[in-house]
Interface confidence: low
């Protein structure tokens, strides 16, 4: 996170990091499922179990959290590794249940009527513990608020080189500030960028941190986020159709998906 | 010439009747006859919310049949109140019980709650009655348990910490 | 280099007490739950007590409880076990140990990855 | 509380065979089993943690598998300085518990 600051014991319960080729981040749904990137799980797609996530903890190397292992990994069949970052969206069904607290809870996804929540200009906030300013992941989560993006303008900023045409689909969102500070970087992957719902009075996840431009926090471009209201059809069918319950153990982690391998010889540079 | 015929001899018999079955506290013999002779039988029903138990062995039905020697085959079942046996646990709640401590009998009461805060409950309002067919059941029919789903979107940020 | 340096070993009357230290270095102290292991030949080896990296809870296996305190000074980065009245059983070699946390349906779980050489303390008459 | 044992308690070997030594826990422990080593007058060395997860610095020929109530610790191609005793833990009840070991012995 650029520009951002440390969070507090309860500011981001849902907040799960995952340790698996590379730091990358979550949140958490109900209490066993992670809503996170595809790009930051699809490195670890022949062994789902190799994933290491953890929650309810602040420090990214403190050895007290609540551990969570993979028991399938659900990478939307329209993500292409090596083709930009579309349908940059994941699910990891845990092996078991999470005991909710006050340090770990979920965080709600969003109502029909979020959008009136998330129109250009109003702020979101992601936290995660990826590159600050200074270079280095961070040891304690950080967040940081920003607003979001108008659409065009956020096209517009990836249209010139060495980005291609395109870039920025409907299904993502931009927020950040056209002076540049403030952003997600490379190790908050998969994080959420949430909203406050003001008549529920509660959390939603309006993005997932996808990508951006080579130097984080750089000014006249923007933090690019999974656009998950358009994912919500998606998210609900694999939740009701592989269970809401963990199962408690047992059996050798999947991942499933629709899509076609291809070799992933182009490594992206993303968040 | 005289003729000759055989010794005819004539059998007459009471048959015993077996004594009169009384029926079990909350149960009821049928059908009712004045007596009972050899052959004759009768059927036991309990109340509804009770079951046949022939010692602690759970019946489907009872029938028993008068012998010869004016005994009835089958000893008298009991018509004892439906157990529906501890309600099995929530998780991420707990259980409640309303009619009285550890009662679990024929249209006892329990109440399922989640834990406050971080749990809500989902599907039915949690209370469930101790139905004649031995299951808990909730007010809209379901045998099954209710759900605490964690509630979502809690923060620190917005509740000044919990 | 993680290193564990037990002492205060030795030998003991049934009845008396006994405190035995930890010193470690090599590492961040105040970050790990920290445990004591204990051996004998006859039962092998035996969980002892864990105290959590803030020394806000203290687990115990039953047959020491109200008899032994696990404590730990995170200024000096050391570790303690006071054992009172002490028995014969508790004969053995102990092993000061860095226990890595995990929870698991609400439940307290750790392994011992990194472990003292031991301390020798024979409760004899 | 959880008991394990362990088979069997002491295994003959020649260097470079492969040996599997087996633990299996009283009750459904999950994957919450851990490996140690403890070689003659040292302290024990942690291998293996939930069932199968390797430890850095760990040789590669040892590898763990199992859940439930059954685990086995494999030694690819056995070396000399593996000659020692091999202990399983269990961290699934917060009782923890340990096996009572298998003697790796030279043949």
């Known amino acids: 996170i650029y520009g951002g600051q440390k969070a507090k014991p309860g500011d981001f319960p849902w907040q799960v990091l995952i340790l698996g080729g590379t730091t990358a981040a979550g949140a958490l749904l109900y209490d066993n499922w992670v809503l996170t990137a595809a790009h930051a799980v699809y490195e670890q797609k022949h062994d789902a179990s190799a994933l290491d996530i953890r929650m309810g903890t602040l420090k990214r190397l403190s050895p007290h959290y609540t551990q969570a292992w993979s028991e399938a990994v659900f990478i939307h069949e329209g993500y292409t590794h090596d083709a930009g970052f579309d349908n940059d969206i994941a699910l990891i069904k845990l092996n078991n249940k999470v005991v909710i607290n006050s340090n770990i809870t979920p965080i709600c996804l969003p109502r029909k009527e979020a959008e009136s929540f998330m129109r250009t200009d109003d702020i979101g906030t992601a936290s995660g513990w990826g590159l600050t300013q200074r270079g280095f992941l961070a040891r304690n989560l950080m967040y940081v608020d920003i607003p979001i993006v108008d659409h065009q303008k956020c096209t517009a900023a990836y249209e010139k080189p060495p980005y291609p045409r395109g870039s920025v689909t409907a299904n993502m969102l931009c927020a950040g500030l056209e002076s540049g500070g403030k952003d997600s970087c490379r190790g908050d992957s998969g994080g959420a960028l949430v909203f406050l719902d003001s008549e529920t009075e509660r959390w939603f996840v309006g993005g997932i941190v996808s990508w951006g431009s080579m130097n984080c926090g750089e000014a006249g471009q923007y933090g690019v986020y999974t656009k998950v209201i358009n994912y919500i059809p998606w998210i609900e069918n694999i939740i009701s159709d592989f269970g809401g319950g963990g199962s408690g153990g047992g059996g050798s982690a999947k991942f499933v998906a629709a899509w076609t391998l291809k070799a992933a010889a182009h490594h992206h540079h993303h968040h | 010439m005289a003729s000759m015929t055989g010794w005819k001899i004539h059998y007459t018999s009471t048959a015993h009747a077996c004594p009169y079955p009384m029926a079990p506290p909350n149960g009821h013999v049928s059908p009712v006859q004045a007596k009972y002779i050899l052959k004759d039988s009768f059927s036991i029903f309990c109340e509804t919310g009770y079951e046949l138990l022939q010692g602690h062995l759970p019946l489907k039905s009872f029938t028993a049949v008068c012998q010869k020697d004016g005994s009835w085959d089958r000893p008298m079942p009991a018509c004892s109140i439906v157990d529906c046996g501890p309600p099995d646990d929530l998780p991420s709640g707990r259980v409640e019980y309303i009619t009285g401590p550890g009662v679990t009998t024929y249209k006892a009461v329990i109440q399922y709650s989640c834990e406050e805060t971080f749990y809500t409950m989902k599907v039915n309002d949690g209370k469930y009655v101790c139905e004649a067919d031995g299951f808990w059941t909730s007010s809209k029919g379901e045998k099954s348990l209710p759900v605490c789903e964690p509630v979502c979107g809690l923060s620190a940020r917005t509740t000044g910490g919990r | 280099e993680v290193q564990l340096v037990e002492s205060g070993g030795g030998l003991v009357q049934p009845g008396r007490s006994l405190s035995l230290s930890c010193a470690a270095s090599g590492f961040t102290f105040n970050d790990y739950n920290m445990a004591w292991v204990r051996q004998t030949p006859k039962k092998g080896l035996e969980w002892v007590a864990t105290?959590?990296?803030?020394?806000?809870?203290?687990y115990y296996r039953d047959s020491v409880k109200g008899r032994f305190t696990i404590s730990r000074e995170n200024a000096k980065s050391t570790l303690y076990l006071q054992m009172d009245s002490l028995r014969s059983e508790d004969t053995a070699t102990y092993y000061c140990?860095?226990?890595?946390?995990?929870?698991?349906?609400?439940?307290?779980?750790?392994?011992?990855?990194?472990w003292g050489q031991g301390v020798m303390v024979t409760v004899s008459s | 509380n959880i008991v394990l044992t362990q088979s069997p308690a002491t295994l003959s070997v020649t260097p470079g065979e492969s040996v599997s030594l087996s633990c299996r826990a009283s009750q459904s422990v999950s994957t919450s089993i851990h490996w140690y080593q403890q070689r003659s007058n040292e302290s024990p060395r942690l291998l293996i943690k939930?069932?199968?997860r390797s430890i850095s610095g760990i040789p590669s020929r040892f590898s763990g598998s199992g859940s439930g109530t059954d685990f086995t610790l494999s030694i690819n191609r056995v070396e000399s300085e593996d000659f020692s005793i091999y202990y399983c833990?269990?961290?699934?009840?917060?009782?923890?518990?340990f096996g009572a070991g298998t003697k790796l012995e030279l043949r």
């Open positions: 939930y069932a199968s």
């Open positions: 140990s860095t226990e890595s946390p995990y929870y698991s349906e609400g439940y307290y779980q750790g392994y011992f990855d990194y």
């Open positions: 105290i959590l990296f803030d020394g806000s809870r203290t």
């Open positions: 833990q269990q961290s699934y009840s917060s009782l923890y518990t």
